[in-house]
């Protein structure tokens, strides 16, 4: 398992929510990506392919997510101060082998301006 801080902008704020960007190498074909808040699994997305090369995308812990050819974005809405925490992208690479797990993360700071419903 490889642990480290994300070397890219992991958090993108918009409209009182946050997009958490979990990147993976272009060469990865099949994988599971989990979003962890502290040690708790918040969201996950698994991409696999069958023997006819058809793609299957599954989520056991569903969040609004978006898949590209080198990242999974998870979206959290209605931000409040309780969202401030360490978030980790836990990537399990199935294909190409060998099987590998990498963990990258960062701290989500919540500022007044990013809150969903500020008191005037």
């Amino acid at each position: 398992e490889i642990n480290g801080s994300a070397n890219y902008e992991m958090f993108i704020f918009h409209n009182g929510g946050v997009q958490i960007l979990c990147k993976y190498p272009d060469i990865v074909q099949q994988f599971k990506m989990q979003l962890l808040k502290g040690g708790q699994i918040l969201c996950d997305l698994t991409k696999t392919k069958g023997s006819g090369n058809k793609v299957s995308i599954k989520s056991l812990k569903f969040c609004h997510s978006q898949l590209s050819n080198n990242s999974v974005s998870f979206f959290l809405y209605n931000l409040d101060r309780s969202h401030a925490n360490y978030y980790f992208c836990n990537l399990s690479i199935f294909d190409p082998p060998p099987f590998k797990v990498t963990l990258t993360g960062g701290y989500l700071h919540i500022y007044e301006s990013q809150l969903c419903c500020q008191l005037k």
Epitope: K49, S51, G52, N53, K54, F94
Partner: antibody, heavy 117, light 111 residues
Framework: EVQLVESGGGLVQPGGSLRLSCAAS????????MDWVRQAPGKGLVWVSN????????EYSPFVKGRFTISRDNAKNTLYLQMNSLRAEDTAVYYC??????????WGQGTLVTVSS | DIVMTQSPDSLAVSLGERATINCKSS??????????LTWYQQKPGQPPKLLIF???TRHTGVPDRFSGSGSGTDFTLTISSLQAEDVAVYYC?????????FGPGTKVDIK
């Protein structure tokens, strides 16, 4: 150790039906696509059908489409193949196989289906 | 459907000698960095066994006398030094799209 054990084969008349089962153990069944591959006596390998991890995607060979149905029960770790309108040319050993992401990495011993009057 | 052909149909090789099996696909199996081509070995009375995936990567536990090469439409399985336990039928197989198809097989015997 991964184990796949097929059952349900036998002798059936043309036009008849059979249901094959494959009991899986030694791995997390619900994490893998599964396939059926068949082999007629003395002949080569022919892919029959596959199913994704939760059964929401299925694919079939043109030879069996509309006659065979693949399904799975993840609670029972079991793969099925319902075969209807059987023909003499369906006579074969039917193998249950695990699609291990980039190849059929585990195979059962096979179950023989004979279609004959 | 992609058609897979193999040559020769059969070959007999002396123990310790090299055996070479060719496989050709009717269209390219290359997508991105990967050739979607696998090789299987089937010994008499047994189910097939995965040998090589992505055209050239040996599966876990496969002896290094087995090697795969090729790209696009032309592929080769080589057994560098044939052993008695290598007597089998060898199949190439593609998983580029549906339906995945197998070659007709090449039977390898001891001369």
């Amino acid at each position: 150790e991964v184990q796949l054990v097929e059952s349900g084969g036998g002798l059936v008349q043309p036009g008849g039906s059979l249901r094959l089962s494959c009991a899986a153990s030694g791995f997390t069944f619900s994490d893998y696509w599964m396939d059926w591959v068949r082999q007629a006596p003395g002949k080569g390998l022919v892919w029959v059908s596959n199913i994704d991890e939760d059964g929401s995607i299925t694919e079939y060979s043109p030879f069996v489409k509309g006659r065979f149905t693949i399904s799975r029960d993840n609670a029972k770790n079991t793969l099925y193949l319902q075969m209807n309108s059987l023909r003499a040319e369906d006579t074969a050993v039917y193998y249950c196989t695990r699609w291990g992401r980039f190849g059929f990495d585990s195979w059962g011993q096979g179950t023989l289906v004979t279609v004959s009057s | 459907d992609i058609v897979m052909t193999q040559s020769p149909d059969s070959l007999a090789v002396s123990l310790g000698e090299r055996a070479t099996i060719n496989c050709k696909s009717s269209q390219s199996l290359l997508s991105g960095s990967f050739n979607y081509l696998t090789w299987y070995q089937q010994k008499p009375g047994q189910p097939p066994k995965l040998l090589i995936f992505y055209a050239s990567t040996r599966h876990t536990g496969v002896p290094d006398r087995f090697s795969g090469s090729g790209s696009g439409t032309d592929f080769t399985l080589t057994i560098s030094s044939l052993q008695a336990e290598d007597v089998a039928v060898y199949y190439c197989h593609h998983h580029y799209n549906a339906p995945p198809t197998f070659g007709p097989g090449t039977k390898v015997d001891i001369k």
